[in-house]
């Protein structure tokens, strides 16, 4: 009993004056609380609480369920308690079968005893199955059995409280432990697509997937730099015990240009937070932007190959593509493909493969592409570089020697005189007249140059060389002179092609 100091309020005294009392089932419980300021008796066991305003608590025929803590409280709020065990061989345990444990915390299996004198008060696995090797517990006859540091692996563990009574094991009703997992990592969040491109009026719908160990993870869609609450719908699943998945779907039924922006899916738990973003771009109408991958003016040598390559952005997706030359559409020799297999891809590549180009195949090659909203085109001017070809080399009636050459780029014609039998013609002769002639062929074709010299300047036997050249190569034609007396013999032209 408590010691009393004069002048200080003291706790009530209880009769019988012991901390624990054992009575047999069917016997009387009689508890007397003595205190000038008596207020009430309180009885507690498991989640049950009863009160009594009489200072004497009497239970005429005690039952096992009368086992518990009896507390007498006075007007000063001071109290004293006695624990009563009502021994009932047929009911050794009082049980509250709800059993929840938070991972890494202790949890109480609530199976207080009605008889403190039984032995081996412990936990047993259901059906005799061994308990987990790392499971530790502390028995307390008045409260139950405390499982220490609950592990996730104990989820759904079936167990009994057990005692030995007269050499036999007696089991309580079974308990199923439900473990609430601790958050040991941030949620895992992912988004259906990282970016969306829509036309005005189209529906925007994006799904965020949140994965965590339990459904108590928090998640929301937010618009960056905005506090507006977004409308979202949820679906969720439990894939096994500690594998929870939620899908949060954000929808804007008719997107507008000013809905463009960054949307964030945010999730957090007690460990931390995670987020993922998606970008929405709403355009008033579709578009096509073409980007040449090579210069649009192309120079290529005769007989060589060239690839005309474009990349283009198209939204909505392209419907028609074609390559055109001289009003003729290519049916083959080209390919068109998406730049990536990504679902959001709007970039494409088109390649036209021109092989062994002839001098006559220069010109404008046009790529055309269209979608449901717009058309676009790009032109490549292809020039075929050709070695000069001497078209004519003649002595005119007026005594002029004339050389006409065609090629691309525009050939230059030089004249040389070789006296006598010399092989090399080194002495250059200035032309009297040089003209660039308009070609009758298509644009981008060969350029024609005409050059003339006055043959009267030559007084000795020899050879005149007309040499036409450009960046690609050179070609020569020759005129032979022979004098008889004062008369020029016939001039014999012939050509020598120099590769």
């Amino acid at each position: 009993q408590p010691s009393v100091s004069p002048g200080e309020p003291s706790p009530p005294s209880i009769h019988p004056g012991k901390s624990d009392l054992i009575v047999r089932v069917g016997d009387e419980i009689r508890l007397l609380c003595t205190d000038p300021g008596f207020v009430k008796w309180t009885f507690e066991i498991l989640d049950e609480t009863n009160e009594n305003k009489q200072n004497e608590w009497i239970t005429e025929k005690a039952e096992a369920t009368n086992t518990g803590k009896y507390t007498c409280t006075n007007k000063h709020g001071l109290s004293n308690s006695i624990y009563v065990f009502v021994r009932d061989p047929a009911k050794l345990f009082l049980v509250d079968r709800s059993l929840y444990g938070k991972e890494d915390n202790d949890t109480l299996v609530r199976c207080p005893l009605t008889d403190p004198e039984v032995t081996n008060y412990s936990l047993k696995g259901c059906q005799g199955k061994p308990l987990p090797k790392d499971l530790r517990f502390i028995p307390d006859p008045k409260a139950g059995i405390m499982i220490k540091s609950v592990k996730r692996a104990y989820h759904r563990l079936c167990l009994h409280c057990s005692v030995d009574q007269e050499g036999k094991s007696v089991l309580s009703e079974k308990f199923i432990l439900k473990v609430r997992p601790a958050f040991k990592a941030v949620p895992v969040v992912s988004v259906s697509k990282a970016s969306y491109l829509l036309r005005e009026g189209e529906e925007f719908t994006v799904t965020c997937t949140i994965k965590d160990v339990s459904s108590s993870v928090y998640s929301t869609w937010k618009r960056e730099n905005s506090q507006t609450k977004l409308q979202e719908k949820y679906n969720s699943w439990h894939h096994g015990d500690f594998n929870y998945e939620r899908q949060a779907t954000l929808t804007i039924s008719s997107a507008r240009v000013n809905d463009s922006g960054v949307f964030m899916c945010y999730a957090n738990n007690t460990f931390g937070s995670a987020n993922v973003t998606t970008t929405l771009e709403v355009v008033d109408k579709g578009f096509i932007n073409i980007f040449p991958m090579i210069n649009t003016t192309v120079f290529v040598n005769d007989g060589e190959n060239v690839d005309l390559i474009v990349e283009y952005e198209a939204f909505p997706k392209p419907e028609h593509q074609q390559w055109i030359y001289m009003n003729r559409t290519f049916t083959d020799k080209w390919e068109d493909y998406p730049k990536s297999e990504n679902e959001s891809n709007i970039r494409y590549v088109s390649e036209l493969h021109l092989t062994r180009l002839k001098g006559t195949e220069g010109g404008t090659y046009t790529f055309l592409v269209s979608n449901s909203d717009v058309n676009a085109a790009i032109a490549f001017n292809v020039y075929v570089n050709t070695k000069p070809e001497i078209l004519t080399y003649d002595r005119l009636v007026n005594g002029m020697l004339q050389c006409v050459a065609a090629g691309f780029p525009e050939p230059t014609i030089d004249w040389y005189f070789c006296p006598g039998t010399e092989q090399r013609c080194s002495a250059s002769v200035l032309p009297v007249d040089v003209q660039t002639l308009n070609s009758s062929g298509p644009p981008f074709g060969k350029l024609v140059v005409q050059s003339s010299i006055d043959s009267s300047a030559f007084k000795h036997n020899g050879t005149v060389e007309c040499k036409a050249y450009n960046d690609v190569g050179k070609t020569s034609a020759y005129f032979n002179f022979a004098f008889k007396g004062n008369n020029k013999e016939q001039i014999h032209p012939h050509t020598l092609f120099t590769p």
């Epitope: 047993k124 259901c126 059906q127 005799g128 061994p130 057990s162 036999k168």
Partner: antibody
Framework: QIQLVQSGPELKKPGESVKISCKAS????????IHWVKQAPGQGLRWMAW????????TYADDFKGRFVFSLEASASTAHLQISNLKNEDTATFFC?????????WGQGTLVTVSS | SYELIQPPSASVTLENTVSITCSGD??????AHWYQQKPDKTILEVIY???ERPSGISDRFSGSSSGTTAILTIRDAQAEDEADYYC???????????FGGGTKLTVL
């Protein structure tokens, strides 16, 4: 005290069936599982299955699915093992076991001999 | 497949001490249990939960576990200890039981 008592020896021909029993006493039958263990002549112990005496649900080892049926007669605190389409390699002593830590108590074993 | 490995045989001279080992990858987190089978085929549990001794079993029998090995120790060996000894544990999330191959103990 806890006891598991098994039925007597059986001599069977290949293709026949046999049903052996294990009667428990000294405890509440539905508190503890009954296990069945096979021991072929000169061999070690092999766990076959356990049966949940509360639900009647058996859990088998992979090698004992198909011809083996594990059942309960709870009102008689008895477990049964039936083997159909007997083969020579089924010749063995079959033990039942149970108790507060799975194999705490053992039956005396039932010898099943399969011979043509 | 999961296995519990025991030496096939062991011997001890009368009144001496002998240890029988049982090794298995899961034994660090699963209990081992030990069973004695006498020549007349009767089987008795001698140790459960690594080191617990059932009532009625002589205190000459003890069990221990370290890492992935469980050990049954018999001190002051007697002629009646001559028997086959089997360890048992469980494996997988379903806790399926599995026996070791057994150790034949001879008392010399």
């Amino acid at each position: 005290q806890i006891q598991l008592v098994q039925s007597g020896p059986e001599l069977k021909k290949p293709g026949e069936s046999v049903k052996i029993s294990c009667k428990a006493s000294g405890y509440t039958f539905t508190d503890y599982a009954i296990h069945w263990v096979k021991q072929a002549p000169g061999q070690g112990l092999r766990w076959m299955a356990w049966i949940n005496t509360e639900t009647g649900k058996p859990t088998y080892a992979d090698d004992f699915k198909g011809r083996f049926v594990f059942s309960l007669e709870a009102s008689a605190s008895t477990a049964h093992l039936q083997i159909s389409n007997l083969k020579n390699e089924d010749t063995a002593t079959f033990f039942c076991a149970g108790g507060s830590h799975w194999f705490a108590y053992w039956g005396q074993g039932t010898l099943v001999t399969v011979s043509s | 497949s999961y296995e519990l490995i025991q030496p096939p045989s062991a011997s001890v001279t009368l009144e001496n001490t002998v240890s029988i080992t049982c090794s298995g990858d899961e034994l660090s987190n699963k209990y081992a249990h030990w069973y004695q089978q006498k020549p007349d085929k009767t089987i008795l549990e001698v140790i459960y939960n690594d080191s617990e001794r059932p009532s009625g079993i002589s205190d000459r029998f003890s069990g221990s576990s370290s890492g992935t090995t469980a050990i049954l120790t018999i001190r002051d060996a007697q002629a009646e200890d001559e028997a086959d000894y089997y360890c048992l544990s469980t494996f997988s999330d379903d806790d399926l039981p599995i026996f070791g191959g057994g150790t034949k103990l001879t008392v010399l």
